[in-house]
Structure formats: C-alpha cells, structure tokens
Interface confidence: medium
C-alpha cells in the first residue's frame, strides 16, 4: 500500500491486546515516517522512523518502554525492511530484517488502546503523547499484519494498492501534475540571503498554481502561477505585495525553462532566459518561510491565504491544480525530485502528458511563421560568422556576415519604418552582383509588443520581404503601447541569387533586430474592482484597499502615485490607521497597498469620497466612490451550550457560538461581553498568536475573532462533588460599532 | 456606587511587615478577581498580585519581583481584600492600590481604591 | 515581560486641539490593551479597553487604535480636564505590565 504523507488507515481494537504479534514490511525515502500507533487514553504503542531510525514506544499504565534500532543502519534507503515486533509473557523483542535489534522485560498488563491502531499516520488524532511524533509515512507498507490479522484492509481512497513508482524516482525524473487537485509539496523553501528555484515546465493549463510558500508571518507569501497563459509571481511581504508578470506564453505544451529568483531587492523570474524583474527599489526583505513548499497546487490553508489576499485569485484558480509536468526541479541549486517530496497527490513519475495534446503544429514552408514571443534566444552570438569556402570572388574575402544591424527606435504606442540604416549590407551589392530584392527577409520569431506590418501583397501572412521592400518604406513596426522600453525581432536573411556566394547565405543568417521604445507618459486613472458603491456599517471603520479602488497606470510604479480626497478637509472621514482622528488628504499609493487606510463612519449620513491620482506629471479625472453607512444589525447564529466533565476545560467554537451582521466585505469587530457572574468556572482566553503553550487565563469578554481562533473556553473549576449535572448560565451582551444586543 | 476603600500603610523599616486591606463596596465582592497594583516615581505603575474566586480555587499570581515576600488573600464574608508584605525593601515603597477585574474584556483594572502609601526606609 | 514603550513622556497642548499618544509593545499582544487617565492626586481611572473599547462614561472624544504591536491614543477636542497622565497596559499575558505614562499639560 501506498502512503503519500499525509494518509493514514483505522483500524478498531476492540479488545486490550495481551499478546501483541506485529509484523511490517516498509520502504521510504524520507527520514522521519510514523509507522503505527495504537491509541488509548493513555496506554499507546507508537513504532516511527526518527533520523531514519526505528524507534518504539510502549506506554503500559505507568511504565514506559523504549527500543530503537543502532545509529549505524539507517532505514530511510528506499529499500524494503522488513520488522517483527513481539509482546509475549512480559518479554518485548524488536527485530529488523530478520537481526534481533533490541529486547526488554515489559509490564505483564494488557495494552488497552480502546482508540484503535492507526497505521501510516495519526489522522486528525490530538492526544498529549503524540507530541513531537514523526511525520505521516511517506513510502510503502508492503505488509503489515497484528496477531495475524491485516492492518492494510480495507484501503480507503487515499491509500494506493501496490507501490507507487514515484517513491523511487530519481532526480531525474520529471513530476507529473495528473491533476485535478495534484500537489507536491517540499521542505520549506529559505529565501534568506536569496532564493531559486527552477525547473522545466510542459503544460497547456492556463491558469495553475505552480509554487507556494508561506512566510511566518501571517499572511506573507511568495505565490508562482500561470494566470491566462502566462508566468506571475506575487511576494507578500509585511502588509505589502510585490507582483510580477512575464510575458512569454508558457501554455502551450511545449517545454519552458522557468526560473524565479528573489533577494532582499528583487524578485525575477525568467522564461526561457526571458526575464522580467522587480527594479532594486523595491526592498522584499527576508520572508521566513513556514511549513512546506508547495508545487503545482494548493493546501486548503495556502487556498484561504490566497482568497483571503486582495489579489483576484479566485477559489476556482485556487482550487485548480497543475496539468502537465515540471522536469529538472532545483530549490536554491540542490536538484528535487519526487523522493524528496514530503507529500504528493495525484502525481505521477514523469511526464505522460497525451501525445495528441501536445503534438507540434507542422508548418509549410512558406506559410506563417510563428510570431509568439521568445522562447529560448540562442546563447550564441547572432549571427553565426559565415566561413566563404574557397575560390570565391574577392568581393567575399574577410566576408563574415551579410549585414550590419543597428537598432530600431519606436514611440511607445507609434509607428517606425524599417530602413536601410538599421539593416546594412557589409558588402557592395552590385560589385558581388546581388540585386535587393534577391536579399530575402523571414520573420523568425515576432517581437512580444508588436507587428512588423507589411505593405506587399501576401507578404503579411508570410512574414517575408526584401531588401528592396525596406528601402521603398513597405515595411514598418507598430508598438502596441505596452511598457517595456526594449523589444526585438528574430530575422533570417538569405539571398536568393544564382551567383557564386557563400553557401551560409543561401542557407540563411539569423540576425536579431533590437527594438528600443521610447515611452510617453500616461496619465493614471482610478478603478473601482468591485464597483463604486461602499457599504459601512454605522460607527465602525472599514480598511480602504486595493480591493475598494485602486491606480491604473501602465507606465509608474505604484511609488510614484499619489492620491488626493477632494473636498473639504474638516471631518474628512479617510484616516491613516496610526493616526486615528486626522484627516488624510493625500496619501501614496504604496499607503494604500499596504493597507494603512481605512474609512472611519462616525455618524450621520456617511461622505463619499472623490479622488484623484497623480503620477506627478498627469492627474486622473475625479472618481467617486459612493458611501453607505447601515444600522449594525446583529443575528445570532449559533448558541448551542456545551457540555463538559467536571474540572475539565472545553473551547467554545463558532459552531457553538456565533453571530452574523449586515456588514458587506467589512471585517467587523464583534465584541461579546459576560453580563452576569459565572458560579461552577471561568472564562478563559489564550494569549496572542493562540500558539501552543500560551497562557489562558480568565477573561470577560472577549471578540468573535477569539472564537474562530480557538482562543475561548469554559473552565470549569467547580471543586464540590454534586450529584446531578450543574448548568452555568452564561449571560452575554453582543456589541457591533455602538450597536448592543442583550441577554444572548 | 462601587467603592474600594484602603486601609494601613505608613512608614516601615527595611525588612519589616505590613498588612494592606481593602474592603468593597457596591457590588457583589465575591464575583470579582481583586488584584493589588503599585505605583512609584521609579517604576511607574506595577502590578504585583491578583485573586481569584471561590469557584477558581482562589488562584493566585504574583510578579516576580514580589514573589515569596507578598500574600493576596481576601474574605468573601467580609467583602475584603488583603495584601501582606514581609521582609520589605526600600524598592517596595510607593503608593499601593487595590483594584477589580470587572465584567469587560480581559485583565484591566475598572475599579481603583483611592491608594495608600507605604514607605519603607531606615 | 513584556514592555511597553510609551512616546512622549510629555506633551503640551491647547484646549481644542488633537493629540496622541503611542504605546509600543515588545512583541504581539493582539488588542489586549488598556488606556488608563490618572488626574493629578487621583487615582487611575479606565479609558479604553481592548485597544479601541470606550469604556462606560468616556467621552467620545477619546480613541484608541492599533493592534499587534502599535497602539495609539487620541484625544481630538482636547478640553481642560483632559490635564492628567494617560497610563497603556497589556493583558496578553503575565505579569501584566504598564507603559510609563504620558503627562499631558494644558497652555
């Protein structure tokens, strides 16, 4: 049977186990697998692979008993290892491979493990002594039985029959995406000092998540995907978000080399040597990565993460996964592959992608030659120096190449004619007897941000003509007003004559025509992403992002935009959130982004608000975003009552305890006050951050954010012995803005 | 009208004792965790112990600085909180007040007695 | 411990105008945060709660901000009975403890 690490098998022991007769046959790559366990209260017998040792635990009543396998033999080598684990007349041996690796005298009382056994992992099982335990198996149980029953019936959908071929797959290997919700995940991905990770990417999805790790602050994130064909990658770091787009197509089912490296000052990624990055300005800072890195899907936590950004990443790109596959997989130069994944689902080892799917387009000759953008830029100087052969006349001698280029310059948005200037021959045409229309020009590979448009009839579908085209001005580049201040064009040249000439220019010369584009400055505008209608509830405030409006403007970062509220400053309702009570009339659109801007309602009819953005050359036009403040209304949605065991503690969760307002994408405070005194326990409320190990302590009040944390419970503290069930009654108030609800 | 009125205080010798009361007023005493907070030119406000009710166990916390030299204790009966000092240091002089956690969010202080002033000198 | 940094220990203001104050937390103590006013030869009296909470009788002209780390009072329309010195505490975990204070004076 397969694990792929995080399944797990239950089996039920509905007796104490006297006798135990345990048998596994396992292999794994990984160092740290939890085998089995059998799960009581407090008795438990744990068997796990630690630093690719075999460790057991035996808990009976008060006595402990450990054994493990020697230091030298480490068990995490793929290979299959069989373990025979006995419990007989207060006798523990533990074998290995058929060696006797330790034995022990053991407490004669039966193991009472009323929970069950758990095999491969402990599922959602949350006891005191599974602390620190082992990850979940990642390899294979080829066997395992208990006093001869086995442990491996019945499967559940999870855990694969046989042994899955990617648990030995090499380096290389390619991962494949089977999808619909496939995913890899990796140890943490440490962007410390800097950060790569690159791999080869064959898929025709459009939109897929290809990698993500989360930051150990929350909410920050580095986020790689394809949106709408092409590669992104978001940073999220601090309250602010870096993101970038490259722009050459990837889903087309061919491969592409992919690479995305970050550090302190910039963010790059790089498709087939094509590269787009952040400028050095932008300071990321170090991301300290938490929990796995994630590889051509998502985890239910990285999805929430990602809806909950202000990024229009909808649930169905996040829920989406991969189809296709990532070969030569790096992380910070160290090679990956699916042995070295924690956890995998839906995968396969290398990359069967349906041949029909991906089956190249077979050109005619003369028909239209691709014009996407570069794909990989031969690493070689273009163009390749011709050698003449031998005997040719003289007008060929030190002949290397056939023109001189120089580079095309273009408006952003305009026009420019390709002239004789920018493509000169190196040569006297006439003294080697070439007419210009015998020199032929084919369109390779287009430029990313326009057309080479051609005025000759036919030519335009080719993406042919002549020298002789160029000097009669038919031949002339459109920009198509995107940003990038560079561009090129892939051209073959070859001459068509029946003269004696080198046979490379028979054959042809690539040249590449550098394209330089001058930009124009566009005046920004304002949008509204979700319209321009905002809804606050009366007395609270609402956070004034890039989810309520936001600058458009393709040629300024977001740090040379300014805003303004126009209209009067006395009781202008946008504040910054460090400076409650003041008026912020202007403000950056990195202030924004950051979220440090929110709408204070402080009664009465609520202001709209008109902007305007600068880039400090232009201002938009005047945008108005329509304010309505509503009457907190308050709905109680759950309130259930717990039931506990005397002395005992239990969390009160949204499931017991919560209510609904009418806000609308406002994150209210909802605030629940005790109104009466408790008589039988206390209250409680656990320290920021809710992490294992903070405090509880008694509280009489305490937030709905609480709850949905898990950071509120019901102690009972009641020492007198009753002898019927006591009922606390527990009264509270409910406040939303200056809105109470009583007697809950 | 919720009122905390504090007794005891005065002048005291290094290594001396002192017991500081505080009886209550206006609201039902027993529901209320008291707690003793001291306020001092050097350190500003300190808080130094705190007692809980019947139903937890009277639990008790102090701050380190006072801790094994300081006793919280209180009398439901009596409606009072009590506050024993012993083996006293210069640093424990300042103005020591007694307060409640009310019915409001978390371990804030709703309710001040009017203070009393311990000073401990030679 | 945690500390709590309070800026600036003294301020000085005119009846009417706005003023705030910062409290800053030694690490994260979520909203868990009061605001005290202490009048002179009085004792504390209670503000804020849970970093933006009024508490019962205060003026509106009293807010509070901040989460995390950061936290602020204001005091917008400040009037002549606002001379006190203006206490921040946390109550995320024990021991409790007190910003320096903040001495507000009247010109």
């Known amino acids: 049977a397969s694990f792929f690490g995080e399944n797990h098998l239950e089996v039920p022991v509905a007796t104490a186990l006297t006798d135990i007769d345990l048998q596994l046959q396992f292999s794994t790559s990984q160092p740290e697998a939890l085998l089995l366990l059998a799960a009581g209260p407090a008795d438990h017998l744990l068997l796990q692979l630690y630093s690719g040792r075999l460790q057991v635990r035996l808990v009976l009543g008060q006595e402990e008993l450990r054994l493990q396998t020697p230091a030298e033999t480490l068990l995490s080598d793929s290979i299959p290892h069989t373990v025979v684990l006995t419990v007989v007349e207060g006798w523990a041996t533990l074998s290995v491979d058929g060696f006797l690796n330790a034995s022990s005298a053991v407490p004669g009382a039966p193991l009472e493990v009323p929970y069950g056994l758990f095999v491969g992992g402990t599922g959602t099982l949350g006891l005191p002594y599974l602390r620190g335990t082992s990850r979940p198996l990642r390899g294979c149980l080829h066997a395992a039985t208990l006093n001869g029953r086995s442990l491996l019936r019945p499967l559940t959908p999870d855990v694969h029959e046989g042994c899955a071929e990617e648990f030995s797959a090499s380096d290389d290997v390619a991962l494949g995406f089977s999808g619909p919700h496939s995913l890899a995940a990796f140890p943490a991905w440490g962007t410390q000092d800097e950060g790569t990770l690159e791999f080869t990417l064959t898929t025709q999805s459009r939109q897929a998540p290809l990698a993500f790790q989360a930051g150990g602050r929350r909410g920050d994130f580095i986020y790689v995907d394809i949106f709408e064909g092409h590669l992104r990658a978001v940073v999220e770091k601090g309250q602010g978000t870096v993101l970038l787009h490259n722009s050459v197509p990837v889903a087309d089912g061919q491969p592409h080399e992919v690479s995305v490296h970050i550090n302190a000052h910039r963010l790059e990624i790089s498709v087939d040597q094509y590269p787009t990055h952040t400028s050095n300005r932008g300071v990321l800072s170090y991301l300290e990565p938490r929990g796995s890195l994630l590889l051509g899907g998502l985890d239910a936590e990285a999805s929430r993460h990602l809806q909950e950004h202000r990024l229009g990443l909808t649930p169905e790109a996040t829920n989406a996964s991969l189809l296709g596959c990532m070969e030569d997989l790096s992380v910070n130069g160290q090679r990956r592959g699916l042995r070295e994944a924690l956890l995998t689902r839906n995968m396969a080892a290398g990359c069967r992608l349906e041949e029909e799917e991906y089956e190249d387009d077979a050109y005619g000759h003369y028909e239209a030659f691709s014009t996407l953008a570069p794909e990989a830029w031969p690493a070689m100087e273009l163009p390749e120096p011709c050698v003449p052969e031998p005997g040719l006349p003289p007008v060929f001698a030190n002949f290397t190449q056939l023109l001189t280029i120089s580079p095309l310059v273009v408006a952003e948005g305009g026009t420019a004619w390709l002239e004789w200037r920018h493509v000169q021959p190196t040569l006297d045409l006439m003294e080697a007897e070439l007419r210009k229309s015998q020199v032929l020009f084919s369109v390779t590979r287009g430029a990313r941000h326009g057309e080479l448009e051609l005025d000759i009839p036919g030519a335009q579908a080719r993406k042919m003509f002549t020298l002789l085209d160029v000097v009669n001005r038919k031949a002339r580049f459109i920009h198509d007003g995107s940003e990038d201040t560079s561009d090129q064009l892939v051209l073959e040249v070859s001459v068509t004559a029946r003269v004696p000439m080198p046979s490379c220019l028979r054959r042809g010369q690539t040249y590449l025509l550098p394209i330089q584009v001058n930009p124009v400055n566009d005046p920004p505008h304002i949008i509204f992403p979700h319209g321009s209608l905002m809804v606050i509830l009366e007395h609270t405030q609402k956070p004034l992002g890039p989810e309520v409006f936001q600058a458009y403007d393709p040629d300024s970062a977001c740090e040379g935009l300014t805003f303004q509220v126009l209209g009067t400053s006395s009781g202008l309702p946008v504040e910054r959130r460090d400076q409650p009570g003041e008026p912020a009339t202007e403000f950056s659109c990195r202030e924004l982004e950051a979220g440090s801007l929110v709408y204070v309602h402080r009664g009465g009819p609520a202001q709209d608000l008109t902007f305007r953005v600068s880039d400090g050359l232009q201002a938009s036009p005047p945008a108005t975003l329509k304010v309505v403040a509503i009457r907190p209304a308050i709905q109680i949605h759950r309130s259930t009552g717990l039931r506990l065991a005397q002395g005992s503690a239990m969390p009160i969760l949204p499931a017991n305890l919560s209510v609904e307002t009418n806000a609308v994408g406002q994150d209210v405070s909802v605030l629940f006050r005790v109104t009466g005194a408790l008589q039988f326990g206390e209250l409680q409320k656990q320290g920021a951050g809710g992490v294992e190990g903070a405090e509880w302590w008694a509280t009489q009040a305490f937030h709905q954010r609480d709850v949905e944390q898990g950071r509120v419970r019901y102690l009972s503290t009641d020492p007198q012995h009753h002898a019927y069930d006591t009922v606390e009654n527990l009264a509270l108030e409910v406040q939303v803005g200056q809105e109470i609800l009583s007697n809950l | 009208q919720v009122k905390l009125q504090q007794s005891g205080g005065g002048l005291v010798q290094p290594g001396g004792s002192m017991k500081l009361s505080c009886v209550v007023s206006?609201?039902?005493?027993?529901?209320?965790?008291m707690n003793w907070v001291r306020q001092s030119p050097e350190k500003g406000l300190e808080w130094i112990a705190e007692?809980?009710?019947?139903?937890?166990?009277?639990?008790?916390y102090y701050a380190e600085s006072v801790k094994g030299r300081f006793t919280i204790s209180r009398d439901d009966s009596k409606s009072s909180a009590y506050l024993q000092m012993i083996n006293l240091r210069a640093e424990d002089t300042g103005i020591y007040y007694c307060?409640?956690?009310?019915?409001?969010?978390?371990?804030?202080?709703?309710?001040w007695g009017q203070g009393t002033t311990v000073t401990v000198s030679s | 411990d945690i500390e709590l940094t309070q800026s600036p220990k003294f301020m000085s203001t005119s009846v009417g105008d706005r003023v705030s104050v910062t409290c800053k937390a030694s690490?994260?103590?979520?909203?868990?945060v009061a605001w005290y006013q202490q009048k002179p030869g009085q004792s504390p009296e209670p503000l804020l709660f849970?970093?933006?909470y009024r508490y019962t009788g205060v003026p509106d002209r009293f807010t509070g901000s901040g989460s995390g780390t950061d936290f602020t009072l204001t005091i917008s329309n400040v009037q002549s009975e606002d001379l006190a010195e203006y206490f921040c505490?946390?109550?995320?975990?024990?021991?409790?403890?007190f910003g320096g204070g903040t001495k507000l004076e009247i010109k």
């Open positions: 307060t409640s956690y009310g019915n409001y969010v978390g371990h804030y202080f709703d309710h």
């Open positions: 206006g609201f039902t005493f027993s529901n209320y965790w």
């Open positions: 007692i809980r009710l019947k139903s937890n166990n009277f639990g008790r």
């Open positions: 690490q994260n103590v979520d909203t868990n």
């Open positions: 849970s970093a933006s």
């Open positions: 505490q946390q109550y995320n975990s024990y021991p409790l403890t």
